[in-house]
Structures are given as C-alpha cells and as structure tokens.
C-alpha cells in the first residue's frame, strides 16, 4: 500500500509549486486494491430484528472488505473476521435512552477469490486469456474489451453475485431475550463482492 | 476522535479475559460522527463524459464526508475541498492502454450544516425541542421520538436533499482530447448529504 496517506493527497495537489504532485499509478492501484476499509454500517442492517427500535448512533464504523481485484472473476472477500462489541444508546419508545451492547463482525483480512461459474456463456474460455486483466466489461466496447475487468463500481450495488468461496463468518452473537448469548441466524454470507464497493452481507 | 483505531477494535473483543473489551459509547459516537473518510469512488461517476472509455483502476480512493450529525436537519457536508491528481491507465478501444492524469476533488474538512426547509409540515417547530436531538425518525415510533435524529443510513441513498450551503467545489480538471487540461463544466454540486452515507455530488 502507498506510503502517502490520502489526507496528504488532498493537500499535495494545490501546494502552489509549478509541478503538481501526481499520485503515481502503482499507488493509485494499491489504494484501490482489495483491502479492509473503515465504513459506516447501519446498525439496523446488522440487527434487522431491532428495526422497531432506534439506536444512537444509528450507524457504526466497521472494517469491511472493499476494492478491486485484477480480474472480473475475482472478488474482494473477507477471509478472516473478528467480532467487536460496541456500546450504543437504545431508545425504547416512551422510555429514557439506555446503553446496550451490540456485537458486529469486522473484516480483518481480505483476499481476491474466485467466484465459480462466473464465466459468461457467450465468451469462450480460450478467448478470455487475450483480454486485459485489469478492466471490467462495458457494453459499448468491442468483445475484446469485455472480457476481464478487475473492478466496476457502477451498477454493482444492485447486482447479485453467486456465493463466493469465503470461510463462513464467525457467527455473530447478540443478546437473546432469555439472557443467554443467542446466535444470530448464521449469515452464510452470500457475499456480494462489490467490485469496488463494499462487501456486505446479502439478506 | 477516539484513540483506538478500528483495526484494534477487531482484535480486542476476543482476548479471552472475562472482561471483554467493549468499545465505549463516546468512542462509538466519535467514529460515526461527521468526518472525512476514505472511500472508493467510481472514476466514471466523476468523469461521466468518459463513460465510453475504461480506466484501471476503475475506482479511486478519495476522502469524502460521511457520518452522523446531531439532528436530522443537520447534514455532514464538505466545507473545504482540495484537488488531487492521479495517474490511471486509460483503455481506448483497439488501442493499447496509456497513462492519463485525472484530477479529483477530495473533502478536506467536513461540518454538520443546516439544510434549510427540511422540517416536515406535520411537525410543529415548537414541538421539536422536546425530542431527543440524537435520533432519526422511524415511522413505528410515537411522534416524540420522530423529531430529530442525528443519522439515518437506511433509505438515504435514494433520498434527494436540497442543496446544502456548501462552498462551490474547486472545478475539476481533466485531460482534454487535445492533451491540454480541459475544465469540466463546474458541478454546482447539489450535495446529497448522505446522513451516515457518503456525501457525494448529485448529478
């Protein structure tokens, strides 16, 4: 990963010198490549059963896998997760706010992994090797340029990808009504590898 | 902001001691509060005129304002931006890839700012003071709890907010066909402050 933090990129471009500081390609690629990045996640998306309650804050900062891989058959997925427990304010209607503990899954280590069966039927396998391995398909381009593309944000939010071969997440725990730690329905995370979006569980 | 980076949260929760390290409320709040956070942004969303070309990587890491404010009438918006120029590979159909320089806008400083005219007609202004100022509206809760909520991710992606009083962005530059940097039509950014989503330009 690049040595220059993004905070410095912001300031380097307009420093008044005639030679604008250009972030070199390898560094741009490195920062866009598959990794765990801090992301704000809606509490209720992680705890859908709590939809009738309100939390403050209503979103929490978690590390989630995101970024590009070098091939459209590869997707950025978590290969190691860990639980983190946070204290939030819960508002029960008509009652004063009170603290609760909620446990979330964080992505600790990310890798580019194959999603089996992703090869399009109209693209013969022996033809794929000729395509650039760092580009995504775009309909307006000729066949040669529609083979393998490492990363496409556009439209990825709504696309549903097949399950990636990702180790099943550490099951998340949350307080059950009976007081014992209750295992959430394991999210056999049909990871939607957000090719440059966030890898979030499909529900 | 909290001293503990999120990377450490991931590892602290399972340390085997009976006293699990729970991230305290003020720290959780601090990390969810309005700030500039690194985010992967689709190149073509920033350069829509380049939709017929392909870039590698197709997304770049930029600092963008995101997070919660203490009131649903406040939104996390950039109050200072700066340009950053990056080197990417551009693929023109039938041609070999070549480096180009693209300039992007980063959010340097974020603030919670009022979005005028956001008060719902069914919520009288004099009633608002009684409501918790750190909670978002949820239909299932009584009126008292639907007044002011600092942060709601859910649905925010599709909601269109009025323009925030944000300084106009530094116009972005990108290489023109003639090789000289060509000024993009300035994006009088109707900022969509993504209450816990990313503040991204509306187009």
């Amino acid at each position: 990963l690049p040595a220059v933090p993004p905070q410095q990129w912001a300031l380097s471009a307009g420093n008044g010198s005639s030679e604008v500081e250009v972030v070199p390609f390898q560094e741009v690629w490195g920062r866009s490549y598959c990794r765990a990045l801090e992301r704000l996640v809606d509490v209720v998306s992680e705890y859908p059963s709590e939809v009738e309650h309100m939390f403050s804050p209503s979103c929490v900062s978690l590390l989630r896998c995101t970024g590009c891989c070098g091939d459209e058959n590869l997707h950025c997925v978590p290969v190691e997760t860990a639980n983190v427990t946070m204290q939030l304010l819960k508002i029960r209607s008509g009652d004063r706010p009170s603290y609760v503990e909620l446990t979330f899954s964080q992505h600790v280590r990310c890798e580019c992994r194959h999603s089996p069966g992703r090869q399009s039927p109209d693209m013969p396998g022996d033809f794929r090797a000729d395509a650039p391995s760092f580009l995504p398909p775009r309909r307006s381009l000729p066949m040669l340029f529609r083979m393998e593309w490492g990363c496409a944000l556009t439209g990825s939010q709504s696309a549903v990808w097949p399950s990636s071969p990702v180790p099943e997440e550490i099951p998340r725990m949350h307080p059950g009504r009976n007081g014992k730690k209750q295992q959430r329905k394991p999210l056999r995370e049909k990871m939607k590898p957000e090719r440059c979006g966030d890898a979030v569980p499909r529900r | 902001l909290p001293a503990v980076p999120p990377q450490q949260w991931a590892l602290s929760a399972g340390n085997g001691s009976s006293e699990v390290e729970v991230v305290p409320f003020q720290e959780v709040w601090g990390r969810s509060y309005c700030r500039a956070l690194e985010r992967l942004v689709d190149v073509v969303s920033e350069y829509p005129s380049e939709v017929e070309h392909m870039f590698s990587p197709s997304c770049v890491s930029l600092l963008r304002c995101t997070g919660c404010c203490g009131d649903e009438n406040l939104h996390c918006v950039p109050v200072e931006t700066a340009n950053v120029t990056m080197q990417l590979l551009k693929i023109r159909s039938g041609d070999r890839p070549s480096y180009v320089e693209l300039t992007f806008s980063q959010h340097v400083r974020c603030e919670c700012r009022h979005s005028p005219g956001r008060q719902s007609p069914d919520m009288p202004g004099d009633f608002r003071a009684d409501a918790p100022s750190f909670l978002p509206p949820r239909r299932s809760l009584p009126m008292l709890f639907r007044m002011e909520w600092g942060c709601a991710l859910t649905g925010s992606q599709s909601a269109v907010w009025p323009s925030s009083p944000v300084p106009e962005e530094i116009p972005r530059m990108h290489p023109g066909r003639n090789g000289k940097k060509q000024q993009r039509k300035p994006l009088r950014e109707k900022m969509k402050p993504e209450r816990c989503g990313d503040a991204v330009p509306r187009r």
Partner: antibody
Framework: QVQLQQSGAELVKPGASVKISCKAS????????INWVKLAPGQGLEWIGW????????KYNEKFKGKATLTIDTSSSTAYMQLSSLTSEDTAVYFC?????????WGQGTLLTVSS | DIVLTQSPDSLAVSLGERVTMNCKSS????????????LAWYQQKPGQSPKLLIY???TRESGVPDRFTGSGSGTDFTLTISSVQAEDVAVYYC????????FGSGTKLEIK
C-alpha cells in the same frame, strides 16, 4: 413494575468473602445493565462496576478490580457481587442499580458489616 | 478519571425558599454532536435508596415535581429547587456518565 430485590444484611469477619444477590423482576433482565454502587458510612456514592446480562460482559472501577466480582444467572434473573478479602473499609451499604447511563431503578441496599 | 466537585457541602433553608446547588466537572461532559451533557442528579433521602431526578443535565425524570430543575452544560451544572418542601430533605448527588461513572461528594439539604 420494575423491582430489584437484594439479599439481607451480612456480618462477616475480616479476610472472608461475601456474595450479595440482586433479583430483578418486571422487565427483561438481559436488556439492561446492572450496576453496583457502594455507600460507606460518612462517604458519598461510589460506582463499583457493571455487568451486561445480555452478554455477561463486565466493567469495573479500577479501585474495585480484584475486590469485586460481578456475575449473573439469567435463568433466575439474578445478579451477584462477590467481595473478597474483606476489611473494615468494605463496611458499607451496597446497591444494585438497573440501567446506564442513568440509574433509574435501585435495589433497597444490602448492609455489609466487616468486623472481628 | 473525571472528578465531580459539588458545592456547597450542606445548606439549611426555610420552607418555600429557592435553593441552588452546583456541580463542577474536571472535564467537559458534553457530547457536542448529540448536544447532550452526560450528567444526572440523584436524591437520597435518609434511610432510602437514591432516586433519579434529572438526566441529560436538564431533563426531568417522569414523576419528579417540576420544582426541580437542572441546568448547565459542559463542565458547570446546577440543580435548583424553586420552593423547598419538607420532603426535599436529602443528600443530592450529581453523577457523570460521559466516561464510566463517578459521583460528586453530595450536597446535604436541611430545613432551618
């Protein structure tokens, strides 16, 4: 209605241990923190620690680490505080209290007297 | 650790009088984003358990008479009883919950 019923007064010898109980009723036990507070004669209130029955997680005031141990039994909706290596300094009324960040329901208190 | 200093230690007033007591924190208890101060006031009558009066520095707990008012923000807080009644004889504690919990030393209210 919400109630926290604490065990009765205790007279114990120095060096011994004692376990005070707090039985909760009238609400879902696992949804709210249980805190423990000390009120020593002629002193003010001191927070000892909390336990979150939904997870069993605990947090202690540094001053009471090694002195107090908080546990729960969710099947009986009961919280416990064990105090060890007792000295005269531990003579006090101990309260269990529901909720955080604001303590809304208090037990009636358990008087612990440490004397030889 | 956050230290809360209450003043005065004790005060004696006549029935119907207005009384104020103070609580000063060694650091700000204000969560500026929420615009809430994590401070509460408790009343402990002789031989009883403490009772929550005020939270968020100024929000009155349900059932608490409106003669009790909390004010202040950040580091300086005040509890005011507009017209003291005989049943208000008690020790009043402030408590911070910004970082864990600490109580002030208490202010003892007596009737002259």
């Amino acid at each position: 209605q919400v109630q926290l019923q604490q065990s009765g007064a205790e007279l114990v010898k120095p060096g011994a241990s004692v376990k005070i109980s707090c039985k909760a009723s009238g609400y879902t036990f696992t949804d709210y923190y249980i805190n423990w507070v000390k009120l020593a004669p002629g002193q003010g209130l001191e927070w000892i620690g909390w336990i979150y029955p939904g997870s069993g997680n605990t947090k202690y005031n540094e001053k009471f680490k090694g002195k107090a141990t908080l546990t729960i039994d969710t099947s009986s909706s009961t919280a416990y505080m064990q105090l060890s290596s007792l000295t005269s300094e531990d003579t006090a009324v101990y309260f269990c209290v529901r909720d955080s960040p604001f303590f809304d329901y208090w037990g009636q208190g358990t008087l612990l007297t440490v004397s030889s | 650790d956050i230290v809360l200093t209450q003043s005065p230690d004790s005060l004696a007033v006549s029935l119907g009088e207005r009384v104020t007591m103070n609580c000063k924190s060694s650091q700000s208890l204000l969560n500026s984003g929420m615009r809430k101060s994590f401070l509460a006031w408790y009343q402990q009558k002789p031989g009883q358990s403490p009772k929550l009066l005020i939270y968020w520095a100024s929000t009155r707990e349900s059932g608490v008479p409106d003669r009790f008012t909390g004010s202040g923000s950040g580091t300086d807080f005040t509890l005011t009883i507009s017209s003291v009644q005989a049943e208000d004889v008690a020790v009043y504690y402030c408590k911070q919950s910004y970082h864990l919990f600490t109580f002030g030393s208490g202010t003892k209210l007596e009737i002259k």
